[in-house]
Structure formats: structure tokens, C-alpha cells
């Protein structure tokens, strides 16, 4: 089992849309998938959870963060729109 994040480090304009790509490899048909982030102050935050049926984000994600769980692609992409300066962090996909 493995996770691949194919989005490079990126600098984006505030107000734009950003998609962070994540694909996973497993034969399990309903994996638990997660996004976490480490902010510049080194604080660690849960961002989003999802499985085949539902997704749930941390309180700060409301309205601007969403996930695209594309089963056929084994993908769990994180979408931030519009992105803000306070979203600056290193984002990690996990399952």
C-alpha cells in the first residue's frame, strides 16, 4: 500500500484555486483517507477525512476546502478555493 502526492511545491496567488493531488494504491475497496498539514509555526492539523461514502473536514475548512475522491483513479485530491495566505503549509495525504 502506498500514497503518491504528485503536486510539486507551489506558490499561488491569494484568491485563486489550488488542487493538491493525491493517489493511493490498495486493493481495499473502501480505504480511510486523510489530509493533514504542518503550518509554518510547526503546528500539526487534521484537514480532511474521507471514505467511499462521506467526507468530513476540520472546522477551518468550511466553505473553502473540499476533497475529490475519485474511486476509479484511486485519488483523494484536496481543493482549496479561494486560497488565503493563512493556508500556507505543507500538506500530507495519508491512509
Amino acid at each position: 500500500d502506498k500514497v503518491t502526492q504528485s503536486s510539486p511545491d507551489q506558490t499561488v496567488a491569494s484568491g485563486s484555486e489550488v488542487v493538491l493531488l493525491c493517489t493511493y494504491d490498495t486493493v481495499y475497496s473502501n480505504p480511510d483517507l486523510f489530509w493533514y498539514r504542518i503550518r509554518p509555526d510547526y503546528s500539526f492539523q487534521f484537514v480532511f477525512y474521507g471514505d467511499n461514502s462521506r467526507s468530513e473536514g476540520a472546522d477551518f475548512t468550511q466553505g473553502r476546502f473540499s476533497v475529490k475522491h475519485i474511486l476509479t483513479q484511486k485519488a483523494f485530491h484536496l481543493v482549496i478555493s479561494p486560497v488565503r495566505t493563512e493556508d500556507s503549509a505543507t500538506y500530507y495525504c495519508a491512509f
Epitope: 475497496s29 467511499n52 462521506r54 475529490k68
Partner: antibody, heavy 121, light 108 residues
Framework: EEKLEESGGGLVQPGGSMKLSCVAS????????MNWVRQSPEKGLEWVGQ??????????HYAESVKGRFTISRDDSKSSVYLQMNNLRAEDTGIYYC????????????WGQGTLVTVSA | DIQMIQSPASLSVSVGETVTITCRAS??????LAWYQQKQGKSPQLLVY???KLADGVPSRFSGSGSGTQYSLKINSLQSEDFGSYYC??????????FGGGTKLEIK
């Protein structure tokens, strides 16, 4: 609202070429693998091929029956996917659909309305 | 390539009856299977995905089941609007993501 619109179908002679287009709107086109599926009364639904993402180097996969004759390409800046069909045969006649599989939290499969390709002398 | 064997090819039934359509994969597809309904002159409409999950707006009389290589679509208490063609499709592993041969459901 998510929408796929195919165009470019018509009548072509055996051995001829044709290029189909599919324009997408209402979703983040660049993150989805795009597929072409065709349908004929004889064969039912037949998966034709697929193109993946820029991060996959736009990898393509084809059904054995079209390999070497059909080429799928995409232009993410135009939210468009194309099917170049060469050396067409009578058995390629059918309705060609552009489709993609969406997020499991929205809708799982999206299809265009199809465009008819007729290969006949 | 994975082959999808769908049966029966056609079925003539009355309104109110229960119908089961089956699909057998040539190898394990780990529930990566969808069922579609298609009416004459229309694009296919998704009914079920990942073998058992009902797509939005699909009536509860439809249900999908199965695992491994054996899958089925059951329609309880058939309604007149259920008549048409049904197809399974796998989406496991490297394409081609083949469809079954289809089942034509006709009114008796």
C-alpha cells in the same frame, strides 16, 4: 453544472479519418481521467480508450480493437478531449460518448449526449 | 484483459415481477463494478457503483450485490420505466475497462 458535449461525427468512407471533440464545463477538468466509449447495435457499449493527467504524462490506454488506429489527446487549457480516428472500418460505426468518473461525494459517472459516426462507402 | 460475462442477454418480464441480472468477471475485480441503465436514444445512466452503492436518485427497488468475480443487479417490483438495456462495467486495474454484453429487459 457538469456538462460534456461531443462534436465532429458524421459520414466517412472506409479507410478515412475523423476527429471527434468533447468540450467540458462545470468541473475541474484537469484532474479527471477522460474516457471515450462507443455504442453500436451489434456490440452494445464498448470502452474505447482513456487519457490520464498531466502528472501521469498524459498516459493513454486503448481497447485492442482500436489500438494503432485511434489516438486520444487533451487540452486542459480548453477543457477539451479529442479522439483522432484513422483507417476507419465499417465496424467503427456507432455513437461515440465522452465520459468521466467523478468524485464519490458528487456523482460517480458523467456522460455526454454522444455523436454518431458512420463508416460507409 | 478482464472479460465481463453478463447474463441473460434478454429478459421478458411483467410489471411487478423481480429480476436479477448477473455479471461474471474473468478475474477478481475487488468490487470495482458499475451498473448502467440505458433507454433507446439516450446516454447510459448510472444505477450502482462499487458493486453495491446506489447512485443518487436511483429508486430503492434497485440493488447491487457481489464480490470477487460474481456480481448481480436486482430489480424488485419492476415498473414500466425500468424497461430498457442494462450493462455492467468493471473499472479495476489497468484498462481496458470492459462492459458486459448487456441485458435487454422487455415487457411481457
Amino acid at each position: 453544472e457538469e456538462k460534456l458535449e461531443e462534436s465532429g461525427g458524421g459520414l466517412v468512407q472506409p479507410g478515412g479519418s475523423m476527429k471527434l471533440s468533447c468540450v467540458a464545463s462545470g468541473f475541474i477538468f484537469s484532474i479527471y481521467w477522460m474516457n471515450w466509449v462507443r455504442q453500436s447495435p451489434e456490440k452494445g457499449l464498448e470502452w474505447v480508450g482513456q487519457i490520464r493527467l498531466k502528472s501521469d504524462n498524459y498516459a493513454t490506454h486503448y481497447a485492442e480493437s482500436v489500438k494503432g488506429r485511434f489516438t486520444i489527446s487533451r487540452d486542459d487549457s480548453k477543457s477539451s478531449v479529442y479522439l483522432q480516428m484513422n483507417n476507419l472500418r465499417a465496424e467503427d460505426t456507432g455513437i461515440y460518448y465522452c465520459m468521466y468518473y467523478g468524485s464519490s461525494y458528487e456523482r460517480f459517472a458523467y456522460w455526454g449526449q454522444g455523436t454518431l459516426v458512420t463508416v460507409s462507402a | 484483459d478482464i472479460q465481463m460475462i453478463q447474463s441473460p442477454a434478454s429478459l421478458s418480464v411483467s410489471v411487478g415481477e423481480t429480476v436479477t441480472i448477473t455479471c461474471r468477471a474473468s478475474e477478481n475485480i475487488y468490487s470495482n463494478l458499475a451498473w448502467y441503465q440505458q433507454k433507446q436514444g439516450k446516454s447510459p445512466q448510472l444505477l450502482v457503483y462499487v458493486a453495491t452503492k446506489l447512485a443518487d436518485g436511483v429508486p430503492s427497488r434497485f440493488s447491487g450485490s457481489g464480490s470477487g468475480t460474481q456480481y448481480s443487479l436486482k430489480i424488485n417490483s419492476l415498473q414500466s420505466e425500468d424497461f430498457g438495456s442494462y450493462y455492467c462495467q468493471h473499472f479495476w486495474g489497468t484498462p481496458p475497462w470492459t462492459f458486459g454484453g448487456g441485458t435487454k429487459l422487455e415487457i411481457k
